[in-house]
Each structure stands twice: as C-alpha cells, then as structure tokens.
C-alpha cells in the first residue's frame, strides 16, 4: 500500500516517501522506486539553511557598502551572510537591508540610549536638573551644576538647555 | 501516457561511432535520469549508465566510461548515447529507460557491428 | 561489481503449479538508507524487459498478485503462485543498490 504521509525529513512524491536534502544541499533528483533521492552541495556564495527539496539554493545576501552595510557574519553553505551597518549608522529594518545615519538629540534632549548597528538612538527630555546644549547621538542630559558644593550661588536659573550660571555670594558690607 | 521512442536500427563497422535517440513524452523530462542497458544476442542485461536532463549529469558503469557519451536535448525531450570505437561485442540490443512513479522502456534498438 | 546469481538457469512449470526463482548478491543490498534495492523483470520472447517488482516485495502497478517477492541481505526470491501461459519469458533479478548496477543471468520460465 503506498504511502499517504512520511517521516520526518521525507517527503512524499509518486506514491514514495524520499529523504529531504540536508541543509546546505539542493535536490538534484527524486529518489525513485530504484533510487535514493540525489543532492549536491551549494555552490560558493550560496547556502539553503534547511532539510529541503529546492533545485536552487538561496543567494548569500550582499552587504552593499554604497547603501552603508557591511558583513557582520560570513554565510556559509547552511547560512545566510548577515550584514550591518558601519560605525555611525544603523538599519532601517530587521532585514538591515540599507542604513541611516544615527539620528543626534538636539538640545534639551539627551541620549536614553545609544544606537547600535540595528536600532536608532533613543533620545528623552532632559528633566528639571538637567540640560544638554550639544546636538549629539552620545551625550546624555548632564546635571545643573551644584553652586553651592562650589561655595557659589545661582545667578542665572537653568534650563533644559543651559546649566545654571554660578557666581559669588553677596558680602555684606 | 509516458512514452520513449528510440531510433532505428544501426548497421557500423568496426571503428566507427554510433548515436542511438530515445524520445521521451507524457511526463515532464527533466524530472527523472534516463538510463541506458545494454542487451548482446542471447545474453543477460548490462547498465551502461544515466543521465539528469536537469543538468546533464551522468554516472556510468566503468566498463562503458571510455566509450559511451550520454547527453540530452530537453528543448526536444531526447537523449542520445554515443558509442565510439566500435567493436563486434557493442553487437546488441540498447534499451533507454526511465523510473520514478513506475518504470518505462524504449523498444529497443539494434545495433550490428559487422565488418 | 556486485554479482547476482540466479537459480535455475531454466524453470519448467505446469499450468496452474507454483515457480520460484532465487536470486543472490555477492553482498549485502541494504542502503544505508534502510531500502534494499531489489528488482525483478520480466521479458516475454522478442519484447522489452517489463518489471514486475521494486524494493523486494514492492509489486508494480498492474501486475497480478500472483507474483511476489521476498528476502532481505543476500538471499532474494521471486514466486508465482500459479504459473498462466502469458507467464512464459526470462526473469532478471537486478540490484540498484550499488554502482554499477548490476542484474542476473536470468531463469527462462517454460510450460512442461
């Protein structure tokens, strides 16, 4: 009686279950009632990261360096190549299929966290205390300067933007 | 329904070279090897050796390696065996034929090699 | 090579009585697969081989389940269970489990 389902890594075709290529193999013929099923490795720059039955293996993805990228880990004939971004820059999509440029908090906004070579800057206000008057993707908001820890005084407030501006105290006279 | 048709019978010298055609129809062709037997007047079979129409690839029986040349022309669904340097014991009957979901025969061709 | 040798070179039979044939390989025909590569043929007088049975046991579609097969290792056998007239011709054991594949010298099954 032929076959209605196969074990695992089998597959049924013409009433026989066949034996799925191994990954990093493509099928190159149907195993039949005289022969196992025929695979051959991937070629250089090619991979198939699963049990399968393609004809075809996959292309390793290119990390084009014109749009930013470059390769993060090396494919092999059972792996995708996987690219990131250069120094300054980060992907665009979980594929990291093109960079941008790590966003920069502008003043009043410091750097929550840094960007890596998959995810932008995270920027946040700076809160009562603390200020920053950089636009930049590294610098997180700074603490008003204490005055008083200086034996100063406040002489001009700050502001999300500015550090307070210290001076003497008043002598009296 | 799944047909192979071969050429027809060959009369050779020794020496010269011979090419034998099995037409295939009714299925997809490059969906399965072609293999090649050969049988001598009163004898037994003998494999001669396969070919993948999907991308040419042979294997072959030792015995035949040297002389026997296995290729295929899928934008007609045929393959073709080339036997060169003819000799008497190449006097035979060649058969193609194809397996996968059932097996199929050529009905033969005959081959004399006779000085 | 691997060789396969069949016994008897000649079979006659009655109508209506059983045939067996026997087939041995000089090795084993299990593939590491844990198929065992098998065959029989049959060839009526003046016509192309016709198969019968794949994988020892495995019967082709149309064929009479008069015929059967069985055996494992080295040691294969083909039986008919009750021989017909158009049962005449030669039967071939074959073995794709090794390259190159090889098939037996054949029994030529004739009516007494």
């Known amino acids: 009686e032929p076959p209605t389902a196969c074990r695992e890594k089998q597959y049924l075709i013409n009433s026989q279950c066949c034996s799925l290529c191994q990954p990093g193999q493509k099928l190159v013929s149907d195993c039949t009632e005289f022969t196992e099923t025929e695979c051959l490795p991937c070629g250089e720059s090619e991979f198939l990261d699963t049990w399968n039955r393609e004809t075809h293996c996959h292309q390793h993805k290119y990390c084009d360096p014109n749009l930013g990228l470059r390769v993060q880990q090396k494919g092999t004939s059972e792996t995708d190549t996987i690219c990131t971004c250069e120094e300054g820059w980060h992907c665009t999509s979980e594929a990291c299929e093109s960079c941008v440029l790590h966003r920069s908090c502008s003043p009043g906004f410091g750097v929550k966290q840094i960007a890596t070579g998959v995810s932008d800057t995270i920027c946040e206000p700076c809160p009562v205390g603390f200020f920053s008057n950089v636009s930049s993707a590294f610098e997180k908001c700074h603490p008003w300067t204490s005055c008083e820890t200086k034996d100063l005084v406040v002489q001009q407030a700050g502001t999300n933007k500015t550090d307070v501006v210290c001076g003497p105290q008043d002598r009296l006279r | 329904q799944v047909q192979l048709v071969q050429s027809g019978a060959e009369v050779k010298k020794p020496g010269a070279s011979v090419k034998l055609s099995c037409k295939a129809s009714?299925?997809?062709?490059?969906?399965?090897?072609i293999y090649w037997v050969k049988q001598a007047p009163g004898q037994g079979l003998e494999w001669i050796g396969g070919?993948?129409?999907?991308?040419?690839?042979?294997n072959f029986n030792e015995k035949f390696k040297s002389r026997a040349t296995l290729t295929v022309d899928t934008s007609i669904s045929t393959a073709y065996m080339e036997l060169s340097r003819l000799r008497s014991e190449d006097t035979a009957v060649y058969y193609c034929?194809?397996?996968?979901?059932?097996?199929?025969w050529g009905q033969g061709t005959t081959l004399t090699v006779s000085s | 090579d691997v060789v396969m040798t069949q016994s008897p070179l000649s079979l006659p039979v009655t109508l209506g009585d059983p045939a067996s044939i026997s087939c041995r390989s000089s090795?084993?025909?299990?593939?590491?697969?844990?198929?065992?590569?098998l065959h029989w043929y049959q060839q009526r007088p003046g016509q192309s081989p016709n198969h019968l049975i794949y994988?020892?046991?495995n019967r082709f579609s149309g064929v009479p389940d008069r015929f059967s097969g069985s055996g494992s290792g080295t040691d294969f056998t083909l039986k008919i269970s009750r021989v017909e007239a158009e049962d005449v011709g030669v039967y071939f054991c074959?073995?794709?489990?090794?390259?190159?594949?090889?098939f037996g010298g054949g029994t030529k099954l004739e009516i007494k």
């Open positions: 034929t194809r397996h996968g979901n059932g097996v199929y």
């Open positions: 009714g299925y997809t062709f490059i969906s399965y090897y």
């Open positions: 070919i993948n129409p999907r991308n040419g690839g042979t």
């Open positions: 090795q084993s025909l299990l593939h590491s697969n844990g198929n065992t590569y």
């Open positions: 994988q020892v046991s």
């Open positions: 074959s073995q794709t489990t090794h390259v190159p594949w090889t």
